[in-house]
């Protein structure tokens, strides 16, 4: 059994979440990857995904979310810019591998966004600053409609749960992946 762990990020409004999801490059380099939010009592919702097949180092921007998949390094970089208090929640990276169920990558991210400045001049990053750093050739990828044969009857765990894992990825059994929802637009 594997502990499904969380890593917390405490940020202020206007700042940027910047995380990297590590995957086995031989197995998943070209696989489509997604960034999901897990709300209590609901199935995970896909907020953004890479193209299919996933393109190397090619930024995909969906609203305030930017995904970059680096095949040579086996890393998916996820950025959420101009954070808002409403963005607080539990997030995860997953890899699509149809017809099998998606794999989740360690760790889940517990994002806590609070109002106000961090207390240091220049530390409050606004949307313009962050989007400016993204190449203008970003594309919006349409995420696949994937419905698990199983259903979720209760909220996913808030901290840890025991699940089996092949290699370094957790096999999700209760998950629905939906078409991109513009919650961050």
């Amino acid at each position: 059994a594997t502990k499904l762990t969380e890593e917390k990020y405490e940020l202020k409004e206007g700042q940027t979440l910047d995380v990297k999801c590590d995957y086995t490059l031989e197995k998943f380099a070209s696989s489509q990857k997604a960034w999901q939010i897990i709300r209590d009592g609901e199935m995970p919702k896909t907020l953004a995904c890479t193209e299919r097949p996933s393109k190397n180092s090619h930024p995909v921007q969906v609203g305030r979310i930017i995904l970059e998949d680096y095949h040579d390094h086996g890393l998916l970089r996820v950025r959420m810019v101009n954070l808002q208090v409403e963005d607080s929640g539990l997030y995860q990276c997953v890899i699509y591998q149809p017809p099998k169920e998606p794999h989740m990558l360690f760790d889940r991210i517990r994002l806590v966004v609070t109002k106000g400045f961090s207390g240091t001049p220049g530390s409050n990053e606004n949307s313009t600053q962050n989007v400016y750093k993204i190449p203008p050739t970003t594309t919006k990828a349409l995420c696949p409609l994937y419905t698990s044969p199983r259903t979720v009857t209760q909220a996913p765990p808030k901290s840890t749960a025991d699940v089996s894992t092949p290699d370094s990825e957790i096999n999700l059994t209760n998950v629905t992946d939906i078409i991109r929802v513009p919650v961050f637009n």
Partner: antibody, heavy 119, light 108 residues
Framework: EVQVLESGGGLVQPGGSLRLSCAAS????????MSWVRQAPGKGLEWVST????????YYADSVKGRFTISRDNSKNTLDLQMNSLRAADTAVYYC????????????WGQGTLVTVSS | EIVMTQSPATLSVSPGERATLSCRAS??????LAWYQQKPGQAPRLLIY???TRATGIPDRFSGSGSGTEFTLTISSLQSEDFAVYYC??????????FGQGTKVEIK
Amino acid sequence: EVQVLESGGGLVQPGGSLRLSCAASGFTFNAYAMSWVRQAPGKGLEWVSTISGSGSTTYYADSVKGRFTISRDNSKNTLDLQMNSLRAADTAVYYCAKVAGSNFFFDHWGQGTLVTVSS
Amino acid sequence: EIVMTQSPATLSVSPGERATLSCRASQSINSNLAWYQQKPGQAPRLLIYGAYTRATGIPDRFSGSGSGTEFTLTISSLQSEDFAVYYCQEFIMWPPWTFGQGTKVEIK
């Protein structure tokens, strides 16, 4: 509780070889990248090498590239650093460190093992 | 390679006082910065990551701020156990992941 414990340090002559090992417990070893970070006597910290959770990706500092090899055995929860062609400048305490799950910082460290390269 | 510069090299502070440590990156690293504490003869310990977030078990007298190239670690009221060397580290993307040279916080 996460624990990492290094072993294998010692005195070696310039040009010689040494193999460091790190035993890990308290976490899902194959899910996390692992690193070696060193600290020369009285100096600061220097990142040496990192290996991904599956072992498919490795990174090295320029100062050790071609001489050091990082590897891991996920069935035994162990991390190794094979050090060849050692130089006096490699003298340091070598720390085994677990890489965080979301970024390349080091959330758990071993107590370190001293490597002395001297004739 | 990103160069991390810490200042001052040594900071003399009395117990109970506030300590402010600085770390500067040679190029923007957004909030990809960590702070570590190291006491003599011990391994480093993670204090702050993502520039602002305290690691598990770290007292709230430690706080991190800054973004881009300028970062600060603040210890609001120094305790005897806080006298140590502090290192910053960037992790923006690819290696080498570099550390600052360290700031020694000593008793005044």
